[in-house]
Interface confidence: medium
Amino acid sequence: GILELAGTVGCVGPRTPIAYMKYGCFCGLGGHGQPRDAIDWCCHGHDCCYTRAEEAGCSPKTERYSWQCVNQSVLCGPAENKCQELLCKCDQEIANCLAQTEYNLKYLFYPQFLCEPDSPKCD
């Protein structure tokens, strides 16, 4: 869920999760267009991961799962079902991805009308 997403991002990366709430074309609710930078690509990848989880019958934004922040790393589990496993992997992936990025202030509160209608395909 959203709480776990914020927690995992805070565990691994140097910035507050709030820094990604309205960033670029994909960080925040919804998303379309061409990702603006590495951070935006992380968020695009996470959107794709959540889409795959939804296709598997999961509820990414609301479903809770167990995880631990150990040594600045996300440890998933113990999972009670496949959805919890998938969702933790999605959040773990974006947390690791964001931790390796440079932050570009110019993409904070980026106007959505500047984002193209079409988006890159998910892997």
Partner: antibody, heavy 121, light 107 residues
Framework: QIQLVQSGPELKKPGETVKISCKAS????????MNWVKQAPGKGLKWMGW????????TYAEEFKGRFAFSLETSASTAYLQINNLKNEDTATYFC??????????????WGQGTTLTVSS | DIQMSQSPASLSASVGETVTMTCRAS??????LAWYQQKQGKSPQLLVY???NLADGVPSRFSGSGSGTQFSLKINSLQPEDFGSYYC?????????FGGGTKLEIK
């Protein structure tokens, strides 16, 4: 209570090797990173690097790459700092410090008492 | 690497006075900064984390402020046990460097 207890003072000659230990107690050793900090006589603190206690993966600050090695004996909740080919400028007090890395709680919350290393011919 | 600079390098003050020391970073740290106190011959002790949060057991006369690249540690009504060296340390990205320290001495 939580404690980090380091090995005693060391007197070594240039070119020798030293291994300093840091034994942790009072918490789950593999849940927190272990950091090493150098303090030369009369000088400030220098972060040497840290070791992930759940994987044993070390990270070294640039200045401490090469002759310095972090290791673990997880079963004994002990971290080690080994310095090879000792030089006079290695004379310092070395601290181990437990790292808490969950934002915003990022800090070194428990420190060892320090191990004084003197390198002299 | 992020450079941390502390000022002043040394400071003398009397018991009861208020002192402020600063820490500057070469890059935006947001609030990823901690302050430590170290007394002669002892290990450092955590005072403040996340720039403004007092660690457990730290007296309320200590306070941290700032974000981004400029941070301060303020000590109100100095007590005899407050004298020693103070270090800031960033936790933005490794290496987690320390500032050069501020030595607080009794006037």
């Amino acid at each position: 209570q939580i404690q980090l207890v380091q090995s005693g003072p060391e007197l070594k000659k240039p070119g020798e090797t030293v291994k300093i230990s840091c034994k942790a107690s009072g918490y789950t050793f593999t849940n927190y990173g272990m950091n090493w900090v150098k303090q030369a006589p009369g000088k400030g603190l220098k972060w040497m690097g840290w070791i992930k206690t759940n994987t044993g993966e070390p990270t070294y600050a640039e200045e401490f790459k090469g002759r310095f090695a972090f290791s673990l004996e997880t079963s004994a909740s002990t971290a080690y700092l080994q310095i090879n080919n000792l030089k006079n400028e290695d004379t310092a007090t070395y601290f181990c410090a437990r790292g808490n890395y969950y934002r915003p709680r990022r800090y070194f919350d428990y420190w060892g008492q320090g191990t004084t290393l003197t390198v002299s011919s | 690497d992020i450079q941390m600079s502390q000022s002043p390098a040394s400071l003398s003050a009397s018991v009861g006075e208020t002192v402020t020391m600063t820490c500057r970073a070469s890059e935006n740290l947001y609030s990823n900064l901690a302050w430590y106190q170290q007394k002669q011959g002892k290990s450092p002790q955590l005072l403040v984390y996340a720039a403004t949060n007092l660690a457990d057991g730290v007296p309320s006369r200590f306070s941290g402020s700032g974000s981004g690249t400029q941070f301060s540690l303020k000590i109100n009504s100095l007590q005899p046990e407050d004298f020693g060296s103070y270090y800031c340390q960033h936790f933005y990205v490794t290496p987690y460097t320390f500032g050069g320290g501020t030595k607080l001495e009794i006037k």
